[in-house]
Interface confidence: low
């Protein structure tokens, strides 16, 4: 079941999924200038078995000064709309990003692809925030948001995460702040 | 290759001031925060100060706000510290160190220059 | 101030030996880090965020802790593990004294 809304989102942070669950899929989108290649997939899809999980399908681009009869593939509107995207340049890449069953790690980049990837998160996925450079976080909480199944409608769990800028607070490796409790989250989880 | 490399060994005398260089690489200077870190002989380390490139801010160990300089040439990708009035107490090595976080945002450094020996000694 | 205190100055350990290192907070914190420098060099990042290996790390070392217990844990140490061990606090930058780790 895909989310049908984005992660929320954190002033100053941007959020990264450490792997992408079955059935999460990544929109084609080729940088300014080229397209993708006539009848070339639209999305890369996270598919697999129990022991093994791969990205379906592949994401090729072409350049658009190149003479070609077809129409030029561009998204449908359903496609264009606010899809969380995740930008591809991250300060480090986890280092315990994959190898959970039923997930796919970071696909490869391909030739001339967009600056920002979009994905289509689906429920149960996990993505993690952190402060961008030059903000630093103030914890309350995990800073972590899951897409859940509630009532039958998706929803996204708020991260507990605050990003502050060393101007506001005269210090980036200031004094540790309190810690709240897991039990003291300001997220509820009670059920129907 | 992200890489910190910095200026070579210096002697001075005490009262003196030395500036020690740090010339980034691999990376886009003005994003990461740069730490000054140093290690007197057979002691362990002693984080001195930060600078952030992208803006020129700055912050302090209390033990060195009053005898040291961050500064940061972001064309020449290189930072500066500066202490002066030098005492034999301050003969150390001297580190610049990267500041990155986790996914979690939580900082640490994640790479380092060589190292520079500053002697102080009459 | 967050001051942290490691414990033992020194561990002197036969290859295949288990290392366990400390590192006390003077008040709680949420996250440590760990760094190995090795005479002469550099320190290297080691563990960071309490219990994550920085790359290139050998799988059998670990860190875990709480509030204000930390422990970076060999499971069998090996020569090249000989070494000088730091933590710090992820948010004041403060070093703790450091453990140094040798190998008979």
């Known amino acids: 079941e895909l989310c049908d809304d984005d992660p929320p989102e954190i002033p100053h942070a941007t959020f990264k999924a450490m792997a992408y669950k079955e059935g999460t899929m990544l929109n084609c989108e080729c940088k300014r200038g080229f397209r993708r290649i006539k009848s070339g997939s639209l999305y890369m899809l996270c598919t697999g078995n129990s022991s093994h999980s791969s990205w379906d399908n592949q994401c090729q681009c072409t350049s658009s000064a190149t003479r070609n009869t077809t129409k030029q593939v561009t998204p449908q509107p359903e496609e264009q709309k606010e899809r969380k995207t995740t930008e591809m340049q991250s300060p480090m890449q986890p280092v315990d990003q994959a190898s959970l069953p039923g997930h796919c790690r970071e696909p490869p980049p391909w030739e001339n692809e967009a600056t920002e990837r979009i994905y289509h998160f689906v429920v149960g996925q996990m993505v993690y925030y952190q402060c961008v450079q030059g903000y630093r976080a103030l914890h309350r909480g995990p800073a972590e948001s899951v897409c859940k199944m509630t009532h039958g409608k998706t929803r996204w769990t708020q991260p507990q995460l605050i990003c502050t800028g060393e101007m506001e607070t005269s210090q980036f490796p200031g004094e540790e702040k309190p810690q709240a409790s897991p039990e003291g989250r300001p997220e509820s989880e009670t059920s129907c | 290759e992200v890489q910190l490399v910095q200026s070579g060994s210096e002697l001075k005398k005490p009262g003196a001031s030395v500036k020690v260089s740090c010339k980034a690489s691999?990376?886009?200077?003005?994003?990461?925060?740069i730490n000054w870190v140093r290690q007197a002989p057979g002691q362990g380390l002693e984080w001195m100060a930060w600078?952030?490139?992208?803006?020129?801010?700055?912050y302090f160990n209390e033990n060195f706000k009053d005898r040291v300089t961050l500064t940061a040439d972001k064309f020449s990708s290189t930072a500066y510290m500066e202490l002066s009035s030098l005492r034999s107490e301050d003969t150390a090595v001297y580190y610049c160190a990267r500041a990155t976080y986790d996914h979690g945002g939580y900082w640490y450094f994640d790479v380092w220059g060589q190292g520079t020996t500053v002697t102080v000694s009459s | 101030e967050i001051v942290l205190s490691q414990s033992p100055a020194t561990l002197s350990l036969s290859p295949g030996e288990r290392a366990t290192l400390s590192c006390r907070a003077s008040s709680s914190v949420s996250h440590i880090h760990w760094y190995q420098q090795k005479p002469g060099s550099s320190p290297k990042p080691w563990i960071y965020a309490t219990s994550n290996l920085a790359s290139g790390v050998p799988g059998r070392f670990s860190g875990s802790g709480s509030g204000t217990s930390y422990s970076l844990t060999v499971s069998r140490v090996e020569a090249e593990d000989a070494a000088t061990y730091y933590c710090?606090?992820?948010?004041?930058?403060?070093f703790g004294g450091g453990t140094k780790v040798e190998i008979k």
């Open positions: 600078i952030f490139p992208g803006n020129g801010n700055t």
């Open positions: 710090q606090h992820w948010n004041s930058f403060t």
């Open positions: 691999g990376y886009t200077f003005t994003d990461y925060y």
